[in-house]
Structures are given as C-alpha cells and as structure tokens.
C-alpha cells in the first residue's frame, strides 16, 4: 500500500503567441481546482475509462477576478497536494490524466457551474520511494507545471511497496526465516499479509494482498465450500470417486453489481463497491453530477450538487453528444453553396467561395456582367461566376477588343491558302480539293464527293466561307 502524490506548481499561459483569454472575468469570478486520474501500465485508454489506480480532486483555489486589459497570469492555485492512495502494489509504470477545472462563482442561484479548462495526459515509469519527478505539460495555449512521486505507507517498503518491514524485536537478529530489510537494516521483513478477510483456515498467500484457496474451498476470501458432484473430467483428491469439485454458488457469482461495480462477499451476503457516479445496493442508480466532471472538450456543466440532480453539458462549437464527447464534422452537411470549399476551424465554420460568389455560405451570385462592357458589339454572358464576352465576327479576346485574324488557326485543309475577308475568311484550295475549307477531294473523273459545284465556280477556284 502507498500514496501517489501530485504537487501543482503553476497553471497559466504557455510560451509563444496566442495567449489564452483569462478564464475569469469581473462579472464571472472563478476559481480553479484539479483532478488527477491514474491507471496502471502504459495504457492508451480513453479519458473516460475508469481510473483503476485511483483518482483525487484538489481543494478549490482562491477566487480570481481578471484585471481588465491585463494578460492572463499564472492563476492562483489550491493549497496542498493531491493524494491518490493505492491499496495494492505500485505498478511501476502508470498513465495519468490531470484536468484543470474552472468553477464559476457568479450570482448563480442553482449553485456553481463547472467547466474543463485543460486536460493533460502522459505515461511514465516511476519507482516508489524515489525523489519527486518534475514535469511540464501543455494543453492548447495553457501550461501546467507539476511534480509527482509514489511513496509506500509503513510497513510497506520497496520500489513496488510489496515488502513489509517491522522494527526488530531483538537487537541482534531477525526472527526465524526472516531477513533484514534493506536499506533499513535495523528492521526485519515481516510475514506476508494476505488480502483482508482471507480465511486463516482455508486460505493462504504467496504475494501480499492475495488470497489463494486450499483444496475444497473457493471464493475471493476462500470462505465458500465447493460441492462434490459427478462430472466428466475428474480433478483433485476426489477423482477416485469419479466425481470432481465444483464451486458452490457464491453470492458474487455472475457479479450482481451493475455499471462496473466490484463485488465482495460479506458473512451474510455481498457488497458492491460502486464506481464514481453510481450508488445503490447494486450500483444501479446513476448519480453523476457536475462535481464528477462529466463534460468533455471544454463543455460547461450545468446541474445541482445533489446526486439526484440532472446535469447537462453546454457544448462548445464543433462538439456534440450528451457529454460533448463527439466531434462534429460540420462540413459533412455541405453548408457551402455554389461549389464553395468548407473549412471547419473548430471555433467556427468558413466557406472559401469560388470566383463570382460571396457570402458566409457562398450564397450570393455576384452579377458578373455588372459594369463590364464587351467592345465592338460583343454581348456579355454570365455564368459559373466568371463573365464571358460573345464577340462579333472578326473580334476576339476577353472583352472583344482584339481584332481576330481568321487565318491564325490555319483553317484551310490540304494546303489551301487562307485569305482574310471583311466577312470572314476565304480558302483558295490546292488542285484536287474543294469545299469551304478545302476538305473534300475531287474525284479523278471530275466528279466530286459533294453535289456539283455551284454554277460559275470550277473546282480549284477560291471558295468564300460565309
């Protein structure tokens, strides 16, 4: 057994640009408190998973009111350590979550409102009994500085708090079979202490805190006799009778405790140890209140302090769910019109509009032709957010200001020569070809692939393209 201790040194704006807004104001003074959650091993568990090693809440810090115009300083902290007692061995590797909470102290009739300001998490190796370890963690624009250590509670010693020591009864040596307790040479290793309540007649232990049963007994405390009945695979001393040992029904069989409660046997029945937020004989009653910090992602908790009180989480933009636990993909609703690009910035939604469109959701179609004249008799055509001029014959370019060279694109096929003409272009076809663009070959017998040429035109004569 032992205690994990956490000392918060400072909580305030981190280095660099973008200092956070002070969490308190003259109208809404507030104070801070901290919550630590510990889990064994180097788990990557979600913040909502149980704090299997334990959790602790700090006291409330001094009331703080922002000075108008002043940058957010390091905020006043609660006094004292956060202490998380652990009953069993210290695991050596652990995961932590440290949350900084804001308690608003306005003239709220229904009691204070809580909201999560910052959450930091990490995974560390730590031997019990060692010195304080210092750490700095950042959450957004906030910075948290803290120290932590794990220490064993007497009589436990060692890096895992599993060895037990007692002062020597005799000055010269330890009792039979017991070694001196390094580094405390003036103390002796004590006999193992089994799990509390472990039956002294039917149970024993090889590690502190465990309870292993002798043949014929079962249950967490070895207090339940096993019944003998016939079965297929004989086991234990009764195999000679072709029977086997089957545990009798225990009060904790099937775990009667709901919502993750743990069951322990009592002389008469069972007892449920309920996780935080649940109560009742079988942990069947949910009593989550704002004090349990149920709102995630900066959600503001609203609710009374009574376990029967409801609570709701007022969620910041970009989050939803009863605990603000779900990130909203607001762009999936395709809020940007006319092909605009959607950007979810977390605190707000932005639409990047295509040319010719404007407005928060690109809903306004700009009049592309407004104030734009097409020269030389061209007409303006609106469409797709970009204006376009349909130019009169002989003119081109964006605004029809350029005189078009109809021969620039080499429109006459099969070596025909192109001549610019006031009404367009004329192709003078090479021998053997005819047509407006010299595209048709003339057959050797004088017939063509087209109806006969109009009167007055011989094959090979220039043909005007109208």
């Amino acid at each position: 057994a032992g205690v994990f201790e956490l000392q918060i040194h400072s909580f305030g704006p981190g280095p660099g640009p973008g200092a956070p807004r002070s969490p308190c104001s003259a109208r809404l003074p507030c104070r801070l408190f901290f919550r630590v959650c510990l889990k064994p091993g180097l788990s990557e568990e979600a913040a909502e998973s149980p704090c299997a090693l334990g959790a602790a809440l700090s006291a409330r810090g001094p009331v703080y009111t922002e000075q108008p115009g002043a940058p957010a300083p390091d905020l006043p902290l609660p006094d004292g350590l956060l202490q998380v007692p652990f009953r069993d061995a210290w695991p050596g590797t652990f995961s932590f979550i440290i949350e900084t909470w804001r308690e608003e102290l306005g003239d709220q009739i229904g009691g204070p409102a809580w909201s999560l300001l910052a959450r930091v998490a990490g995974r560390r190796r730590l031997a019990a009994g060692g010195p304080w370890a210092r750490d700095i963690q950042r959450a957004g624009a906030w910075e948290l500085r803290f120290s932590y250590r794990a220490r064993c509670e007497p009589p436990a010693v060692g890096t895992a708090c599993t060895r037990l020591c007692r002062p020597r009864s005799a000055p010269s040596r330890c009792g039979p079979g017991l070694r001196p307790c390094a580094p405390l040479e003036d103390e002796c290793e004590a006999p193992l202490v089994c799990r509390a309540g472990c039956s002294p007649e039917h149970g024993f232990c090889e590690q502190p805190g465990e309870c292993r049963c002798l043949e014929g007994w079962t249950g967490p405390l070895c207090t339940v006799p096993v019944s003998t009945s016939s079965c297929l695979s004989p086991r234990g001393p009764s195999s000679a009778t072709t029977g086997c040992l089957v545990p009798g029904p225990g009060p904790c069989d099937g775990n009667p405790c709901a919502n993750g409660g743990s069951c322990s046997e009592t002389p008469r029945s069972f007892e449920c140890t309920c996780p935080r937020g649940f109560y009742g004989l079988r942990c069947e009653v949910s009593g989550v209140t704002c004090a349990d910090g149920p709102c995630f992602n900066g959600g503001l908790c609203v609710g009374g302090a009574d376990p029967d009180s409801a609570y709701i989480c007022h969620c910041p933009p970009g989050f939803q769910g009863s605990n603000c636990e779900k990130r909203v993909d607001r762009c999936s609703l395709q809020p940007c019109r006319n092909g605009g690009l959607c950007l979810d910035l977390g605190h707000a939604l932005r639409c990047r509009c295509r040319a010719g469109f404007a407005g928060p959701r690109c809903e306004h179609d700009l009049d592309d032709c407004a104030g734009r004249a097409c020269a030389n008799g061209g007409t303006c055509v609106e469409g797709g957010g970009a204006h376009r001029c349909s130019c009169a014959l002989g003119f081109g370019g964006r605004d029809c200001r350029e005189r078009a060279d109809p021969c620039a694109a080499r429109p006459c096929a099969h070596g025909g020569r192109c001549y610019a003409h006031f009404s367009g272009l004329v192709c003078a076809c090479a021998p053997g070809y005819m047509g407006a663009r010299c595209e048709f070959p003339v057959h050797p017998d004088g017939a063509s692939a087209l109806p006969a040429a109009p009167p007055g035109l011989r094959p090979g004569d220039p043909q005007r393209y109208l």
Epitope: G106, A113, I312
Partner: nanobody
Framework: EVQLVESGGGEVQPGGSLRLSCGPS????????VGWWRQAPGKQRNLVAG???????NYAQSVKGRFTISRDNAKNTVYLQMSSLRAEDTAVYYC?????????WGQGTLVTVKP
C-alpha cells in the same frame, strides 16, 4: 435585465399531471442550453430536466419516465410535461437558460401535490 417567465404551476392531486411553460422569450434560442430546476422548502435547488445546446436531454433520477422536457425554437418556449405527480414533487419550479457567457432565471412557479 431580461427575465424568463414561467406559467402552468398550481395544485394537483397525486397521480395528476401539469404542463409548465417558459416564455416566449428572445432568450430561448437554439444556441442556449435550457432546463427546469426545482427547490423544495429547506432543500437546495436541483436540475430536474435539461436540454443542451446540442439537443441532448437529461433528467433527474427521481423524475425519469414521468417528466418530459421539450423546446419549441420557433415559439422561443420551453415546456415541462409532468405526469404521475407525487407529494415529493412539491416545489417551486424555475425556468433556466444559459450560454457560455450568461445565465438567465425565471421567478419560479409553485407546484403543489397534495390529496
């Protein structure tokens, strides 16, 4: 300062029903979380039912299955439908709304459940 106005309270027999209304008020908009609190004599005020700004509802354990909270954003009004009323539901019921910056309360309406 703008206040919320409750109506619909009164005296009712055990097992009876009442419907409380709050509003209309320009305060009750879809971006606010709204709720009904109650305070019995000598007890602290507790949230009976609430609807968050993202539409999640929650109820006190003691009223689940009996009370229903709803909101009409078009009418800027919040309702609390109470049925199977019990003596322990006797209290002053307060309408409530809040955003991140401000919170708003009504003056309260008395609900009395007695045979």
């Amino acid at each position: 300062e703008v206040q919320l106005v409750e109506s619909g309270g009164g005296e009712v027999q055990p097992g009876g029903s009442l419907r409380l209304s709050c509003g209309p008020s320009e305060i009750i908009t879809s971006d606010k979380s709204v709720g009904w609190w109650r305070q019995a004599p000598g007890k602290q005020r507790n949230l009976v039912a609430g609807i968050s700004n993202v539409g999640s509802t929650n109820y006190a354990q003691s009223v689940k299955g009996r009370f229903t909270i709803s909101r009409d954003n078009a009418k800027n009004t919040v309702y609390l439908q109470m049925s199977s009323l019990r003596a322990e539901d006797t209290a002053v019921y307060y309408c409530y709304a809040r955003d991140f910056e401000n919170e708003y309360w009504g003056q309260g309406t008395l609900v009395t459940v007695k045979p």
